[in-house]
């Protein structure tokens, strides 16, 4: 789903307050709800009728450093006989997410939010038919 | 997918540098790749064999303020005849994502990362059979 544009108003102080110096803000250390965990049914990527593989991307200057991307294995979906049915389609489910980018020059470290598009998994759909003139 | 624990090392300066004052860091205003957009096939939540609905949660002190959660419509999956087949299961696909929490006391505004569990959509799976003693 979409993350709206900041318009940067979210990060501004109330109008009656002095502006943020040097275009930066104070980010407190620590993460709220850090222990919260995904509780998905096991191995759904293999058990799905629209199965997918995972690819891990790693960047030490990003938090989280590891971002996992899904790729649908087939164009079609897997039927009850375990065969690919291409009258149906496996399609990716995408999500916009935030990561934190670390930038450093010597001992001066700053951070910036970055929007990343993550393919989370796949689902089986009836394709939309377009009549081409 | 899982976001690892920070261990707070990501946000620390190199060991040879003076520590971060007051447990906070500098977050630059603006978002990298802000214009990046989801490009999913249209209405997949209705066209899927494991369809879902969306619920929007809104919080003005969170960025993004709008977080969309999916809920699978059925226990089973929709077959070619448009009927629910309960030999298969619709299961949620979850993703851990980061949001920014805004905290203010008067003109003092600070921000903190928060982990949120988002259900992005649903997929149709073969249920795992557990033999209960």
């Amino acid at each position: 789903r979409k993350i709206p544009k900041v318009g940067h108003t979210f990060f501004q102080k109330p109008e009656s307050c002095p502006p943020v110096p040097g275009g930066s803000m104070k980010l407190d250390i620590g993460i709220i709800n850090e222990n919260q965990r995904v509780s998905m049914s096991r191995n759904i990527e293999s058990r799905s009728t629209s199965p997918w593989n995972y690819t891990v991307t790693w960047d030490p200057n990003r938090y989280p450093s590891e971002v996992v991307q899904a790729q649908c294995r087939n164009l079609g979906c897997i039927n009850a006989q375990g065969k690919e049915d291409i009258s149906m389609n496996s399609v990716p489910i995408q999500q916009e997410t935030l990561v934190v980018r670390r930038k450093h020059q010597g001992c001066s470290v700053s951070f910036q939010l970055e929007k990343v598009l993550v393919t989370v998994g796949c689902t089986c759909v009836t394709p939309v038919i377009h009549h081409v003139q | 997918r899982k976001i690892p624990k920070v261990g707070h090392t990501f946000f620390q300066k190199p060991e040879s540098c003076p520590p971060v004052p007051g447990g906070s860091m500098k977050l630059d205003i603006g978002i990298i790749n802000e214009n990046q957009r989801v490009s999913m096939s249209r209405n997949i939540e209705s066209r899927s064999t494991s369809p879902w609905n969306y619920t929007v949660t809104w919080d003005p002190n969170r960025y993004p303020s709008e977080v969309v959660q999916a809920q699978c419509r059925n226990l089973g999956c929709i077959n070619a005849q448009g009927k629910e087949d309960i030999s298969m299961n619709s299961v949620p696909i979850q993703q851990e994502t980061l949001v920014v929490r805004r905290k203010h006391q008067g003109c003092s505004v600070s921000f903190q990362l928060e982990k949120v569990l988002v259900t992005v959509g649903c997929t149709c799976v073969t249920p795992v059979i557990h033999h209960v003693q």
Partner: nanobody, 116 residues
Framework: QVQLVESGGGLVRTGGSLRLSCSVS????????MGWYRQVPGRQRELVAM????????YYADSVKGRFTISRINANNTIYLQMNNLKPEDTAIYYC?????????MGQGTQVTVSS
């Protein structure tokens, strides 16, 4: 924008052969397929044959297996449907299709008539 150009339909006697061709232009992803559906007025559209654009995997309806062969020339994104030992029940409008995940683009169709 996807464009499809079909050719090769016509009238043929039972047991005869025809070759349909179709070329596709526009945005083509690696996870896509090209093929043919057919439709008899008043009946449901039927998938006849499909070929995966990168893997080259082929799929056939049970009713045409062993008689129809789908092939593809990668260089110009053209597919062919070689139809042998045609039967009266093969009479239909044949639509060239290009399938991107979630979207099926369908041409204007070409009539195939098999007379007994």
């Amino acid at each position: 924008q996807v464009q499809l150009v079909e050719s090769g339909g016509g009238l043929v006697r039972t047991g005869g052969s025809l070759r349909l061709s179709c070329s596709v232009s526009g945005d083509i992803s690696s996870q896509s397929a090209m093929g043919w559906y057919r439709q008899v007025p008043g009946r449901q559209r039927e998938l006849v044959a499909m070929i995966h654009t990168t893997k080259g995997d082929t799929y056939y309806a049970d009713s045409v297996k062993g008689r129809f062969t789908i092939s593809r020339i990668n260089a110009n994104n053209t597919i062919y449907l070689q139809m042998n030992n045609l039967k009266p029940e093969d009479t239909a409008i044949y639509y060239c299709t290009h399938n991107e995940p979630g979207d099926l683009y369908m041409g204007q169709g070409t009539q195939v008539t098999v007379s007994s």
